[in-house]
């Protein structure tokens, strides 16, 4: 058996480190074996067999220049085995960091802090963590640890399935390289690292008959479970097309009706989501949608709805414009008659 | 030689924008994590922001959350720290610093003032 | 985000007398912490790091030890050139923070 211990990696390559000490061992001979030492496709002998060092040869310092292919041989001159030497540094502890777009899984990735110049793999698992006594502030590990399975395609990310909202997870990332290892513990709460997907479909149509209206309809992320036991609320923001300034309005539902949309001009808006109990952080914004209120008047018809104000909306006073207020209706609805006369505005 | 030269501090209003940049050379800038710290006149050490080699992953002090973005050219070896919504208190020396690893600044460069004031 | 605090803040000692330095964590960091002088004017320089090592090119009258939440900076015979603040700072978690610093003057 060969006296030289496999790293990890490639086999026949031997590692080491720059301005280190770095030994070389001979692969086909006997522990201890004095050899000779040559550079693959150089004659000059690097180390002779009477150095005392056996069937290992010593870099001192080594540097980029001492990477390459060598060649070690017997007393007789048989061929003892080639050696690659591969320079580079042992891991540090990799970046992690984990993200939640639900309440039942999260996925955490990572990325070295420092390349080593090694071929590197990293392992995952994890723990979930359980509070000891009512009142205790220590943590002990519970049952585990479990892997956390890595993603297929090589992506530097791993997904915990079935997480509990309310338990805490201690993950493990740990670098590994042929010259060691170093580990990332990360504690991880479900309920600080969830952020929701943003709200999907969003539609803004004009309501007929109502020049400042627009009508905002969503739905839930396909990412959110299907039957929530938490629910999301959502945060709505639009603008007129040119206007820098959002106004913002919280819906209590999955539609809004903007009540103070400037007449004639396209709307630009935009939903974000949150755990309805404030875990975690908002959503990034959905993809902007745009409509533009209706121009004309209200149908002569009066919807089954429609109880006290038939009249058409004013005209707009462009020498008075009102500033754009925020919607502020509690729980949207398709039309809502409070107010008696819509005043229209127009950015001046 | 490990060598790191910050730019682009100065004198900016409250409110105004900044950004300071880090050359580096000596070493193999794309294999290490980077980092600005920062020391107000007469204070102490303020860990500001780091990047991974890759870029991948960021962090950021509370202080400056949402206002600055860092950033890294590996092309170009040169470290970036974007500063929106400047505000007095981030009057301070800023120095580029370098790993091993993460949080172990190894080498620094000699800073660059950034004075906010009207 | 985990508190790091220095004693004393400032001290002044005579050549050749032991100065020592202490740190304190909020929480556990385990060896993570690392040692800085900086001089009047100048960047910080690392000289301890992972607690107890010594950076390459620092003099071995400087030494660190600890581990947890207490740790020890010690210079064993302080030198002029040793005038400088110096600070702790833990790298345990991915936001790095320094202790307040303790100033070294000579008697």
């Known amino acids: 058996s060969s006296p030289c211990p496999q790293a990890w990696g490639p086999p026949g390559v031997q590692y080491g480190q720059p301005g280190r000490s770095v030994k070389l061992c001979c692969p086909g001979v006997t522990a201890g074996d004095p050899v000779s030492w040559f550079r693959d496709g150089e004659p000059k002998l690097l180390q002779g067999p009477d150095s005392g060092l056996g069937h290992e040869l010593v870099l001192a310092q080594a540097d980029s220049t001492d990477e390459g292919t060598y060649i070690c041989q017997t007393l007789d001159g048989a061929l003892g085995g080639t050696v690659t030497l591969q320079l580079g540094y042992p891991p540090a502890r990799p970046v992690v960091s984990c993200q939640a777009a639900d309440y039942e899984n999260f996925s955490c990735t990572w990325s070295p802090s420092q390349i080593s110049g090694l071929p590197t793999r990293y392992l995952t698992s994890y723990r979930k963590k359980t509070v000891l006594g009512a009142d205790s502030q220590r943590r002990s590990p519970s049952t585990g640890p479990w892997p956390c399975p890595q993603d297929p395609l090589g992506a530097a990310r791993c997904v915990v399935h079935g997480a509990e909202f309310w338990s805490q997870y201690r993950i493990n990332v740990t670098e590994v390289n042929p010259l060691g290892a170093s580990t990332r513990l990360l504690d991880v709460s479900l309920q600080s690292i969830l952020r929701p997907d943003p709200p999907q479909g969003l539609r803004v149509e004009s309501v007929p008959g109502y020049p400042r209206r627009l009508r905002a309809s969503w739905t839930y992320p396909a990412s959110w479970p299907c039957q929530p036991h938490f629910l999301l609320k959502f945060r709505l923001q639009y603008r007129p097309a040119q206007h820098p300034a959002w106004s913002t309005v919280e819906p209590a539902g999955l539609e809004e009706v903007i009540t103070d949309a400037v007449a004639g001009l396209p709307h630009a808006v935009r939903v974000s989501a949150r755990d309805f109990l404030d875990a975690g952080t908002w959503s990034t914004w959905s993809p902007e949608a745009w409509g533009t209120p209706s121009t004309g008047t209200i149908p002569k018809e009066i919807p089954a709805w429609g109880q006290l104000h038939t009249q058409p909306e004013v005209e707009p006073q462009v020498d008075s414009p009102a500033p754009p207020r925020p919607s502020l209706q509690p729980h949207p609805r398709l039309l809502d008659h409070r107010d008696s006369v819509e005043q229209v505005a127009v950015l001046a | 030689e490990v060598q790191l030269l910050e730019s682009g501090g100065g004198l900016v209003q409250p409110g105004g924008s900044l950004r300071l940049s880090c050359a580096a050379s000596?070493?193999?800038?794309?294999?290490?994590?980077m980092t600005w710290v920062r020391q107000a006149p007469g204070k102490g050490l303020e860990w500001v922001s780091s990047?991974?080699?890759?870029?991948?992953?960021?962090q950021y002090a509370d202080s400056v959350k949402g206002r600055f973005t860092i950033s890294r050219d590996n092309s170009k070896n040169t470290l970036y720290l974007q500063m929106n919504s400047l505000r007095a208190e981030d009057t301070a020396v800023y120095y580029c610093?370098?790993?091993?690893?993460?949080?172990?600044?190894?080498?620094w460069g000699r800073g660059t003032l950034v004075t906010v004031s009207s | 985000d985990i508190q790091m605090t220095q004693s004393p803040s400032s001290l002044s000692a005579s050549v050749g007398d032991r100065v020592t330095i202490t740190c304190q964590a909020s929480q556990d960091i385990n060896n993570y912490l690392n040692w800085y002088q900086q001089k009047p004017g100048k960047a910080p320089k690392l000289l301890i790091y992972?607690?107890?090592n010594l950076q390459t090119g620092v003099p071995s009258r400087f030494s660190g030890s600890g581990s947890g939440t207490d740790f020890t900076f010690t210079i064993s015979s302080l030198q002029p050139e040793d005038i400088a603040t110096y600070y702790c700072q833990q790298y345990d978690n991915l936001s790095p923070t320094f202790g307040p610093g303790t100033k070294v003057d000579i008697k």
């Open positions: 992972d607690a107890s």
């Open positions: 610093a370098k790993g091993p690893g993460w949080g172990t600044f190894a080498y």
């Open positions: 990047i991974v080699p890759s870029g991948g992953h960021t």
């Open positions: 000596g070493f193999t800038f794309s294999w290490y994590s």
